[in-house]
């Protein structure tokens, strides 16, 4: 690895550093499918963007292997806790990899938001935030799931979102 | 752009990399103004610092354009949910830009913390955390707002804070 | 500092950039000691890793000084709020430094999760997330504490965790 090679590497690194992989995807009316699949996301409009990562059917797809800080927030809300809806909400980030048939839990939260309703108001709001560093290989995917997704409130992309950046 | 130019760029980049923009601002007694404006923050004492970002009247001001992970946490608390205080709390990060007259919502949470009071204790505590990646131009500002800010509890700068770093 | 020196520095920086310090530690059965000490963490198995940081008795130990985004999430849960258990939970990240005899609060949250139990179910779940940028010197340590730790629920390392990366 001579000087020229090193030089090329440095130039290359500078260029790649300029596009340190990052993404921020936002909630949209189409996010909740009701199909049992992961949440879907807006990738281009408003605050949403992809830089050095790609997107496919709800998933952030890694193009460059490395350690990523991944995060998601979901806005929850309702009026009381209707029968048949889970009183415990699970919000999680999951990895899909060609090496395993099933999704792998990465970061997960469980909350009981309905208890936030008060005697004077049955309306409640709650928010769940997850964030942490995980190693991801090229081609691996990360998705967000919420059970029961009917309690997720979407409005304008600021209250429920999903993102990542390489660290 | 010859070798000398590239060399200068690399040297420059190395120097700028040494000061990757970052900041962490902390809550203080003066944070809550009651004026309807954004929360104000400590920028120097204790854990607070600014590196490659500046501060003005509650706002983190961007000096170098790019993608930033911005975050804020606020500690909420009270005794019961007094009449006339919002039972729904909105905690948000907002962008100010010379290009628009109004603030733009970036990341927002709504919570109903008063429902956390129990039959045995009217005291309740709750915490709201927001974080996400947004693109910011030089000169743009980010502020934190909480409605109703009277439910924000300040103590020592560790419970309510606001920060950012370039990714 | 001639061209050769600068070249060496750049090569060195590229190498160090490859190992930008980062870690993600996960909750395990041994995390809760009941001894009044900090939570303990898994450092190698599953999603856990250390890169450019070390670990000692629950603490992330800094080897390279700088600004770090540190974070922790704990999963809380219970059935009602048994007498003798604090109805207010404190979850915090604390710094240990050779320069002071006592731990220093960095980021702290207080929550009243028991209020999440509903009339129809005494079971409740809650989650607390903390994250923020702090300056850490080589040799300084960061630990996580939860009071009352008996309300922390551990399962598989995805619900309670602790991490950091240099920014």
């Amino acid at each position: 690895d001579g000087p020229a090679g090193s030089w090329e590497q440095l130039i290359q690194e500078r260029r790649s550093h300029e596009v340190n992989p990052a993404a921020h995807l936002t909630g949209a009316n189409s996010s909740l499918t009701g199909s049992g699949g992961p949440l879907l996301w807006e990738t281009q409009l408003g605050l949403a963007f992809l830089r050095g990562l790609s997107y496919h059917d709800g998933a952030l797809v890694v193009t460059k292997a490395g350690y990523y800080y991944i995060y998601s927030k979901v806005q929850l809300g309702g009026v009381g806790c209707p029968l048949g809806l889970a009183s415990t909400i699970t919000h999680g980030l999951y990895k899909r990899t060609p090496r395993y048939p099933e999704e792998l839990e990465l970061l997960v939260s469980q909350q009981s938001p309905c208890g936030r309703a008060t005697s004077s108001s049955r309306v409640w709001w709650d928010s769940s935030f997850l964030g942490g560093v995980v190693h991801l290989e090229a081609g691996e995917e990360v998705v967000v799931r919420v059970l029961d997704e009917r309690l997720v409130r979407l409005r304008d992309g600021t209250r429920s979102y999903f993102g990542a950046f390489m660290v | 752009d010859g070798p000398a130019g590239s060399w200068e760029q690399l040297i420059q980049e190395r120097r700028s990399h040494e000061v990757n923009p970052a900041a962490h601002l902390t809550g203080a007694n003066s944070s809550l103004t009651g004026s309807g404006g954004p929360l104000l923050w400590e920028t120097q004492l204790g854990l607070a610092f600014l590196r490659g970002l500046s501060y003005h009247d509650g706002a983190l001001v961007v000096t170098k354009a790019g993608y930033y992970y911005i975050y804020s946490k606020v500690q909420l608390g009270g005794v019961g949910c007094p009449l006339g205080l919002a039972s729904t709390i909105t905690h948000g990060l907002y962008k100010r830009t010379p290009r628009y007259p109004e603030e733009l919502e970036l990341l927002v949470s709504q919570q109903s913390p008063c429902g956390r009071a129990t039959s045995s204790s009217r005291v309740w505590w709750d915490s709201s955390f927001l974080g996400g990646v947004v693109h910011l131009e030089a000169g743009e500002e980010v502020v934190v707002r909480v409605l109703d800010e009277r439910l924000v509890r300040l103590r020592d700068g560790t419970r309510s804070y606001f920060g950012a770093f370039m990714v | 500092d001639g061209p050769a020196g600068s070249w060496e520095q750049l090569i060195q920086e590229r190498r160090s950039h490859e190992v930008n310090p980062a870690a993600h530690l996960t909750g395990a059965n041994s995390s809760l000691t009941g001894s009044g000490g900090p939570l303990l963490w898994e450092t190698q198995l599953g999603l856990a890793f250390l890169r450019g940081l070390s670990y000692h008795d629950g603490a992330l130990v800094v080897t390279k000084a700088g600004y770090y985004y540190i974070y922790s999430k704990v999963q809380l849960g219970g059935v009602g709020c048994p007498l003798g258990l604090a109805s207010t939970i404190t979850h915090g990240l604390y710094k240990r430094t050779p320069r002071y005899p006592e731990e220093l609060e960095l980021l702290v949250s207080q929550q009243s999760p028991c209020g999440r139990a509903t009339s129809s179910s005494r079971v409740w779940w809650d989650s607390s997330f903390l994250g923020g940028v702090v300056h850490l010197e080589a040799g300084e340590e960061v630990v996580v504490r939860v009071l009352d730790e008996r309300l922390v629920r551990l399962r598989d390392g995805t619900r309670s965790y602790f991490g950091a990366f240099m920014v």
């Epitope: 004077s120 | 608390g77 009270g78 005794v79 019961g80 949910c81 007094p82 009449l83 006339g84 205080l85 009217r122 005291v123 009277r150 439910l151 509890r153 103590r155 | -």
Partner: antibody, heavy 121, light 111 residues
Framework: QVQLVQSGAEVKKPGASVKVSCKAS????????VHWVRQAPGQGLEWIGA????????SYNQKFKGRATLTADKSTSTAYMELSSLRSEDTAVYYC??????????????WGQGTLVTVSS | DIVMTQSPDSLAVSLGERATINCKAS??????????MNWYQQKPGQPPKLLIY???NLESGVPDRFSGSGSGTDFTLTISSLQAEDVAVYYC?????????FGQGTKVEIK
Amino acid sequence: QVQLVQSGAEVKKPGASVKVSCKASGYTFTSYNVHWVRQAPGQGLEWIGAVYPGNGDTSYNQKFKGRATLTADKSTSTAYMELSSLRSEDTAVYYCARGSYYYTSSYFDHWGQGTLVTVSS
Amino acid sequence: DIVMTQSPDSLAVSLGERATINCKASQSVDFDGDSYMNWYQQKPGQPPKLLIYTASNLESGVPDRFSGSGSGTDFTLTISSLQAEDVAVYYCQQSYEDPFTFGQGTKVEIK
């Protein structure tokens, strides 16, 4: 300046009802609670309840729940306290007061001049 | 309900002297470093007037000879140098929980 002006004195028979008004001026009526406090002759102060004119929400001292009704009319910036099933021990001066907050701690920073309600057969 | 007990019931103090009124709550009225305790002054034929809120904060326009202190269950209102216009009945009041309750009052007179 902030002013709370109450209606005039009333004399009522036992079992009747009384409705006292409190007209606010000098501040945004919908942004503050209006509390009602009474003081029997030569006695101390007793909190009846409060109304939040912003949305009409109320909070009552259980002692008066069912007999006291607190309302507010945003269009006229006026709060009302109606007390039913009057008895002689309800004879008192009734005050309205504006409720402000320091964090979540309430205090009464402006008071009306008081309305004497006399219950006598 | 939280019971507020004031002492003494009445107090005679010389002009220019210090007057001290105590108030005891039946349970703590503290939260996160704040005490949910207020003090009012009432002169004959007038409504009460706010003096001190949250135990120690002086209401705007109130002379600084008035001060409040205390925490938990025990609170004090102090008039550092009694003036003739301070003759009145003084009430403590807790706003920690409904129903808000007042002390029975302390009458301050000139000796």
